[in-house]
């Protein structure tokens, strides 16, 4: 942006500049060009010997300018176009300036002026151009600065040329007010900070409803000496609830929202949300629908799932396999998990209590992703109730629970109590007992044994009695032994796995129980 301090051509001859000597030399004249009246200051004393004619502008207020640009449009006649070449004719003139804090009026003193440059034409007006009224217009520009006083004068010294000044324009440059990346940069005077730093760094301010992104750089631009903006750094983003429309931030329309400062546009409110108002940063969930803390605001609101479908409990002696299917209503979420809880009741007393500590699950019973689990180590003559709850990311936001239950009665025997009766270097004699009340239900006992540390092979012996001798064993070797009752319903509860050791060949008669 150019800020014009003086424009002779625009003043249509109304600027009364000072000429020295008065009444000689420079003269204000009017001409017709392109059917329009134009004004010019002209001098053409080319046959009168040495000349020293001065034309001084009116006093020009400097405003904020530090460096001024002087644009001259002028024409110079060819000295050879005059008869005899006009021996004292010149084809240049001199440009001067003087700074002052006050207007000296008609008090003109040459010594106050500093020469800026000798102004020479690129093109001179030869006779044929003059006659044909082809004005050979020259344009020259000079820069002066830094200026420090309140104002200044320009002066033109004629030394014997035939010259006409058609335009004298003095201006300084500003980087114009600008909107860039949602930041407003103020009108800035174009001035070099120093010779090594030709750019002035200017901080911008974010437009209404725009902010500097978190952790980002504030908007900066560089104003060059030529009044041009360069090298934008940083940016502003429309704040939550607002989106970029051209160079402004506009509130999100009703039914739309924007949750954070970003370059993104406002998004339509997702499913199961209430219609938002203008400038919404989020959309509230419909009644009965929720948003998990980790859910993005762009995601539909969801609700807890319904209970699992078709829960079945299949008893297998001391074990139960629980199977179920996914809920009919997932609540609109994929993050469904299941948790299994266990309650046991004593048939005699009707007392009930939690049984998590006494049973064993095939996998941890909370946050199950599969739809089956096996529960073992169930006690005989006990009623068990299993509850399978379906949960998703928003289940924690409501008090109600979605579960299905299944009950099962365990009728199997208690595990046998096993002890080592006798042993030798090659045999182990094992006995066991179970409550008398259960003995009639036992069909046989199954004794499973193997060497400790040998997972690949094991031996099984069945017997109807309460003891067995295991022969052909290796000396000084530890064996793992388990006894399990077999009933009509299937396997009963198994005993603990015991460790028994045969004697060494030179060993003692000590027994390990």
């Amino acid at each position: 942006k150019e800020v014009v301090l003086l424009d002779f051509a625009a003043m249509k001859g109304e600027l009364g500049w000072l000429t020295h000597p008065y009444g000689k030399g420079w003269d204000l004249m009017q001409n017709i060009m392109d059917d329009m009246p134009i004004y010019m200051y002209s001098v053409c004393n080319v046959v009168s010997g040495d000349q020293d004619n001065w034309l001084r502008t009116n006093w020009v207020y400097r405003e904020e300018a530090e460096r001024i640009f002087i644009e001259l449009k002028f024409t110079v006649r060819d000295c050879n176009s005059f008869p005899g070449g006009a021996s004292s004719c010149k084809e240049t003139f001199n440009l001067y300036y003087a700074e002052s804090d006050v207007d000296y009026g008609t008090n003109f003193q040459k010594r106050q002026f500093t020469k800026i440059d000798t102004i020479a034409p690129d093109e001179i007006t030869v006779s044929s151009d003059f006659e044909a009224r082809n004005v050979k217009l020259n344009v020259e520009e000079r820069m002066v600065g830094p200026l420090t006083r309140k104002g200044f004068y320009l002066a033109f010294q004629d030394i014997g040329a035939c010259v006409a000044l058609l335009s004298v324009r003095v201006y300084y440059k500003k980087c114009p007010e600008m909107l860039q990346s949602l930041a407003r940069f103020p009108e800035t005077i174009a001035v070099a900070v120093s010779d090594t730093q030709p750019l002035a760094t200017v901080a911008g301010t974010c437009v209404d409803h725009a902010v500097v992104p978190y952790g980002g750089e504030g908007p900066l631009m560089h104003c060059t000496v030529d009044g041009e903006w360069l090298v934008p750094i940083g940016q502003c983003l429309c704040q939550e609830g607002y989106e970029k429309v051209e160079d402004a931030c506009r509130a999100c329309s009703p039914g739309f929202f924007k949750s954070e400062a970003s370059e993104s546009p406002c998004l339509e409110c997702p499913e199961h949300t209430l219609p938002s108002t203008e400038g919404a940063t989020s959309c509230q969930c419909e009644e009965g629908y929720f948003r998990a803390p980790e859910d993005p605001l762009s995601m539909s609101c969801t609700r807890p799932p319904s209970a699992p479908n078709y829960l079945t409990a299949i008893g297998m002696g001391a074990k139960v396999e629980l199977r179920w299917t996914a809920p009919k209503d997932t609540g609109g979420r994929q993050d469904i998990v299941y948790s299994v809880t266990c309650e046991q009741c004593w048939p005699e007393s009707g007392e009930c209590g939690p049984c998590e500590a006494s049973v064993r699950y095939s996998e941890p019973p909370h946050a199950l992703t599969r739809t089956s689990v096996t529960v073992s180590d169930l006690e005989p003559h006990m009623n068990y109730t299993f509850a399978v709850e379906a949960r998703n990311g928003v289940s924690g936001l409501v008090t109600s629970r979605s579960f299905r239950t299944a009950s099962v009665s365990i009728n199997q025997t208690e595990p046998p109590k096993v002890r080592l009766e006798d042993r030798s270097t090659t045999s182990l004699s094992v006995t066991w007992s179970i409550p008398v009340s259960q003995q009639s239900r036992v069909w046989k006992y199954e004794v499973t044994y193997r060497k400790k540390g040998d997972a690949n092979s094991y031996n099984v012996r069945r017997t109807e009695g309460f003891s067995v001798t295991l022969d052909d064993l290796a000396p000084d070797t530890t064996y793992l032994v388990q006894v399990q009752a077999l009933t009509q319903e299937g396997q009963g509860a198994g005993s603990k796995v015991h460790e028994f050791q045969t004697l060494s060949t030179e060993g003692s008669a000590n027994m390990a129980v």
């Epitope: 004249m29 009017q30 001409n31 010019m40 046959v47 044929s128 010259v163 006409a164």
Partner: antibody
């Protein structure tokens, strides 16, 4: 020395034609704008027509437009004025005049010209 | 067309007198004005161009001034050779009109 010598004047009936000539010497004719200026007996000066150094452009006073034609032959250093459909009010002394931009000490040419050099004139009388 | 009006149309003066003739244009002609001198039976002679510039060979007692619409020709000290008719001419437009003339006679 600049010399301009008009010829071709005389008595002519209304509606008749006449061709005036102006012989130039003592200067470079092809550099000069040339013009015809007339002066009715006992009256003031009236510009009639002009022609540029190379033969154009040409301008005419409203009073003669369409009837008079100005021309020049730079090889012969001669200016002409062909006058047709003459009227009584065309009776006047016709001067040939010249302008050389070299003698016009101004930076920018004026919108038109003035006349630096004049011939002695030739009398044209239109009468029945 | 631009009309040029001279005044007075005639004047009587003595040798050595200072004489001023004025010329008024019907519209502004800047400084595009010439002055001519004409003696009886002779061709006009250029005295001044561009309102104030003296033509080559013209005595310095002649001077011109003015701009816009008001112009004047001054003879600072009238000489016997100066008794003649003086015409102004505008060349601000292609019509190049002359004033009606001012006759300077011996008193």
């Amino acid at each position: 020395e600049v010399q301009l010598l008009e010829s071709g004047g005389g008595l002519v009936q209304p509606g008749g034609s006449l061709r005036l000539s102006c012989a130039a010497s003592g200067f470079t004719f092809s550099h000069y704008m040339m013009a015809w200026v007339r002066q009715a007996p006992g009256k003031g000066l009236e510009w009639v027509s002009r022609i540029g150094p190379s033969g154009g452009p040409t301008h005419y006073a409203d009073s003669v437009k369409g009837r008079f034609t100005i021309s020049r032959d730079n090889s012969k250093n001669t200016l002409y004025l062909q006058m047709n459909s003459l009227r009584a009010e065309d009776t006047a002394v016709y001067y040939c005049a010249g302008y050389d931009s070299g003698y016009d000490y101004v930076a920018v040419a004026g919108p038109a010209e003035y006349f630096q050099h004049w011939g002695q004139g030739t009398l044209v009388t239109v009468s029945s | 067309d631009i009309q040029m009006t001279q005044s007075p149309s005639s004047l009587s003066a003595s040798v050595g007198d200072r004489v001023t003739i004025t010329c008024r244009a019907s519209q502004s002609i800047s400084t595009w004005l010439a002055w001519y001198q004409q003696k009886p039976g002779k061709a006009p002679k250029l005295l001044i161009y561009k309102a104030s510039n003296l033509h080559t060979g013209v005595p310095s007692r002649f001077s011109g001034s003015g701009s816009g619409t008001e112009f004047s020709l001054t003879i600072s000290s009238l000489q016997p050779d100066d008794f003649a008719t003086y015409y102004c001419q505008q060349y601000n437009s292609y019509s190049r009109t002359f004033g009606q003339g001012t006759k300077v006679e011996i008193k």
